[in-house]
């Protein structure tokens, strides 16, 4: 009788479909993620079962608190989909899918440097480019450690490119480009370049 | 080239033990499922058990207990253990490989081994 | 225990023909596709035909195909051909009483 009145349960809103979930969303491979399987009732003693595709990955007991599955993506393939199973007695639904997006960190990105020298200006072009990584990628260029042009995406493998132009300074500068893409918290930098001060003939970077 | 190879089958006597080996190669255990299966002589196939990726096993009800799926990684070896055996378990066993995370898409088979109990 | 039922056990039918098998389980197959189907010839391991339940597998003629969802399937051979003359087996797979997996008993298809 109680298995019927679970059932029963089902088909109205106490006992709803589960919810599957991760803090995390975009991974990078040999990343280790946990899944939480959770439900609305916290009354009930529930079995939980995750899957991914046509496979079976583990199953946890219960009640009030979510299940956590924890996983590491180490395989394209483990990018999902996931879908988690909520059981009571002989009764059962499923969450919606779940899947991860794999994304390759960005290697530290190479900055490469032109400058148009005037009398009284320095026209400089501040090209960056990260060889490895998943796209799209986001490039910002520093001076002296501040930023100085907005988040430039490329959605293709080129450099981003940002000029700009300065009265011939009297002092050193030092340029540096970041590359980020959708890992969060995962940036990378150039090695900096530094453009030294006017005064005789140094500017390595000038086209004559 | 992708494969399997059974081993270990042969003649046993009633409540002896058999140890079946499957042997794959061109491809790693840690991403796919091994499958045992079995069909006696004139009959159907019959799913036995199951190990995944992971290292889960699966049996059938009547396999449950008897039987015990396990593998060695650094081999890339699955094994059938089977206690207790008796006259019906008299059958061709073939172990089959699963699609990647499909369990039991199997595309992969092996060519069988042949266990025969009796006295 | 899941109980997969096939039909017929044997059919017997002349190259052109088309041949319809059906597989009936007990209890609905996880994510109501988790069917596949096989080809079994004498002394030879089971080949994979079908799987999702209508997915053709690789090197598999178009002549095969798959249909169904839940608990009924069916598997078509469109145009007999002579080397299509084997058994037939459906394997379901199950979440309700643990992960499991339950084949058909056969269907035998044979030269009228």
């Known amino acids: 009788r109680k298995a019927v009145l679970d059932c029963e349960a089902m088909k109205t809103n106490e006992f709803p479909s589960p919810c599957l979930d991760s803090k995390t969303k975009v991974v990078m491979k040999g990343q280790n993620v946990s899944m939480f399987c959770s439900h609305k009732n916290k009354s009930l003693q529930i079995t939980y079962s995750l899957f991914r595709r046509k496979t079976h990955l583990g199953t946890q007991d219960g009640k009030g608190e979510p299940a956590i599955f924890n996983l590491s993506i180490t395989e394209a393939h483990e990018s999902g989909p996931y879908k988690c199973k909520a059981q009571v007695t002989s009764c059962s639904k499923y969450s919606r899918d779940f899947s991860f997006t794999i994304v390759d960190p960005v290697t530290s990105p190479v900055l490469n440097i032109m400058v148009i020298q005037t009398e009284t200006d320095r026209h400089i072009t501040l090209h960056c480019l990260s060889v490895n990584g998943s796209l799209p990628i986001n490039y910002t260029f520093f001076e002296n450690h501040v930023a100085i042009s907005p988040a430039i995406s490329k959605y293709d493998r080129e450099p981003a490119e940002f000029n700009l132009t300065k009265k011939n300074p009297g002092e050193e500068e030092e340029y540096r480009c970041e590359a980020k893409n959708r890992l969060p918290n995962y940036a990378t930098y150039s090695h900096p370049v530094t453009m030294p001060s006017t005064g005789g003939d140094s500017c390595p970077f000038c086209l004559k | 080239e992708v494969q399997l190879v059974e081993s270990g089958g042969g003649l046993v006597q009633p409540g002896g033990s058999l140890r079946l080996s499957c042997a794959a190669s061109?491809?790693?255990?840690?991403?796919?499922?091994i499958t045992w299966v079995r069909q006696a002589p004139g009959k159907g196939l019959e799913w036995i058990g199951t190990?995944?990726?992971?290292?889960?096993?699966y049996y059938s009800t009547w396999a449950k207990g008897r039987f015990t799926i396990s593998r060695d990684n650094s081999k890339n070896t699955v094994y059938l253990q089977m206690n207790s055996l008796r006259a019906e378990d008299t059958a061709v066993y073939y172990c089959?490989?699963?699609?990647?995370?499909?369990?039991?898409?199997?595309?992969?088979w092996g060519q069988g081994t042949l266990v025969t109990v009796s006295s | 225990d899941i109980q997969m039922t096939q039909s017929p056990s044997s059919l017997s039918a002349s190259v052109g023909d088309r041949v319809t098998i059906t597989c009936q389980s007990s209890?609905?197959?996880?994510?109501?596709?988790?069917l596949s189907w096989y080809q079994q010839k004498p002394g030879k391991a089971p080949k994979l035909l079908i799987y999702?339940?209508?997915r053709l597998a690789s090197g598999v003629p178009s002549r095969f195909s798959g249909s169904g969802s839940g608990t009924d399937f069916t598997l078509t051979i469109s145009s007999l051909q002579p080397e299509d003359f084997a058994t037939y087996y459906c394997?379901?797979?199950?979440?309700?009483?643990?992960?499991?997996?339950?084949f058909g008993q056969g269907t035998k298809v044979e030269i009228k």
């Open positions: 089959a490989r699963g699609y990647v995370d499909s369990d039991w898409y199997l595309n992969i």
């Open positions: 061109g491809f790693s255990l840690t991403i796919y499922t």
């Open positions: 190990i995944n990726s992971y290292g889960n096993t």
């Open positions: 209890e609905s197959v996880y994510d109501n596709n988790y």
């Open positions: 999702d339940a209508s």
């Open positions: 394997l379901g797979g199950y979440d309700s009483s643990g992960w499991y997996a339950a």
